[in-house]
Interface confidence: low
């Protein structure tokens, strides 16, 4: 079954900056990726970026740079400042839509024991939504 992985890293050089990387392990082509924080989009989360393979990328503060890393993975840099600054226990979620194969969403946050600039390798996260 396809899975989504989420990796969150705090930048060593800027402690208020985060890098979120998400990947889709399925075989289908991706039609839309939505990145949110504070929980899943639609369940209290706030959308940070939407990436469409043909129509481009849209992002909202404090997202600084969203981009495709591969055909099935994306990265997003967050630059915290003031009220919109992420904190260490912020939850970030990525939803990959690959209809009709399905839509999959997974969430992650900074590992509690992580030092700035360090992170665990990406690991598959639970499938939260599928069709």
């Amino acid at each position: 079954t396809p899975e989504v992985w989420v990796q969150v890293r705090m930048e060593a050089t800027e402690l208020s900056s985060f890098t979120i990387r998400c990947g889709f392990l399925g075989s289908g082509s991706i039609s839309l990726v939505t990145v949110s924080w504070g929980g899943p989009n639609g369940a209290g989360g706030t959308t940070l970026a939407v990436l469409h393979p043909e129509r481009g990328i849209r992002q909202w503060a404090p997202a600084r740079q969203a981009r495709w890393e591969t055909q099935s993975s994306i990265s997003l840099i967050l630059e915290g400042s003031g009220a919109s600054s992420p904190c260490a226990n912020t939850t970030f979620c990525c939803k990959f839509a690959s209809f009709p194969e399905g839509s999959w969403e997974a969430c992650g946050s900074l590992p509690p024991s992580s030092d700035p600039g360090l992170s665990a390798p990406p690991t598959p996260a639970p499938i939260l939504r599928a069709d």
Epitope: P40, G42, A97, S103, L128, R129
Partner: antibody
Framework: EVQLQESGGGSVKPGGSLQLSCAAS????????MSWIRQSPEKKLEWVAE????????YYPDTVTGRFTISRDNAKNTLYLEMSSLRSEDTAMYYC????????WGQGTLVTVSA | DVVMTQSHKFVSTSVGGRVSITCKAS??????VAWYQQKPGQSPKLLIY???YRFTGVPDRFTGSGSGTDFTLTINGVQAEDLAVYSC?????????FGGGTKLEIK
């Protein structure tokens, strides 16, 4: 063949409660997100709840948040919608549906809220 | 919330004709729009998803197009069994929202 069969509809007074069920067959229920959608007497469609495949996450529009609760029992291949503090505007045909967008729909169960 | 507007409540054509049903989103939803068909006394059925992709078993006379805020469902070679209400829905953001529906009448 994908089949979805709703039950539990009926008449209830304003402020009352009702639980709808949706029995699923013909596919691996635990692998799919599921939703409830309703259709008013004026035939307007409104999505009212969604639950993730494992039941971890639930989603609602503002119109039903705090009054409706979606849940599922993957061992029984059954989806539920618990409705409380019902209002006259909740009168509708309630459908369960698979996926996002909604690839398969049940035949619906009618809920009537009236004094 | 994204408001989906179908400005025409009714459209009419003859058997064998061609008809276009339009839908407008209140904001850019990229290509995340689906179309449903609901025949009298039946539940809705998914025809098109992601603007232009036909769902399983949908005849190729049904075609979807558009992007951003303006979307169209076109039925070529309309058949008598196509008599139904057609509704659009955005699957871009939560809450998922539907248009009010357009009824296809056969002359």
């Amino acid at each position: 063949e994908v089949q979805l069969q709703e039950s539990g509809g009926g008449s209830v007074k304003p402020g009352g409660s009702l639980q709808l069920s949706c029995a699923a067959s013909g596919f691996t229920f635990s692998s799919y997100g599921m939703s409830w959608i309703r259709q008013s007497p004026e035939k307007k469609l409104e999505w009212v709840a969604e639950i993730s495949s494992g039941g971890t996450y639930t989603y609602y529009p503002d119109t039903v948040t705090g009054r409706f609760t979606i849940s599922r029992d993957n061992a029984k291949n059954t989806l539920y919608l618990e409705m409380s503090s019902l209002r006259s505007e909740d009168t509708a045909m309630y459908y369960c549906a698979r996926g996002d967008p909604f690839g398969y729909w049940g035949q619906g169960t009618l809920v009537t809220v009236s004094a | 919330d994204v408001v989906m507007t179908q400005s025409h409540k009714f459209v009419s054509t003859s058997v064998g004709g061609r008809v276009s049903i339009t839908c407008k989103a209140s904001q850019d939803v990229m290509t995340a729009v689906a179309w449903y068909q609901q025949k009298p006394g039946q539940s809705p059925k998914l025809l098109i998803y992601s603007t232009s992709y036909r769902f399983t078993g949908v005849p190729d006379r049904f075609t979807g197009s558009g992007s951003g805020t303006d979307f169209t469902l076109t039925i070529n070679g309309v058949q008598a069994e196509d008599l139904a209400v057609y509704s659009c829905q955005q699957h871009y953001s939560t809450p998922r929202t539907f248009g009010g529906g357009t009824k296809l009448e056969i002359k």
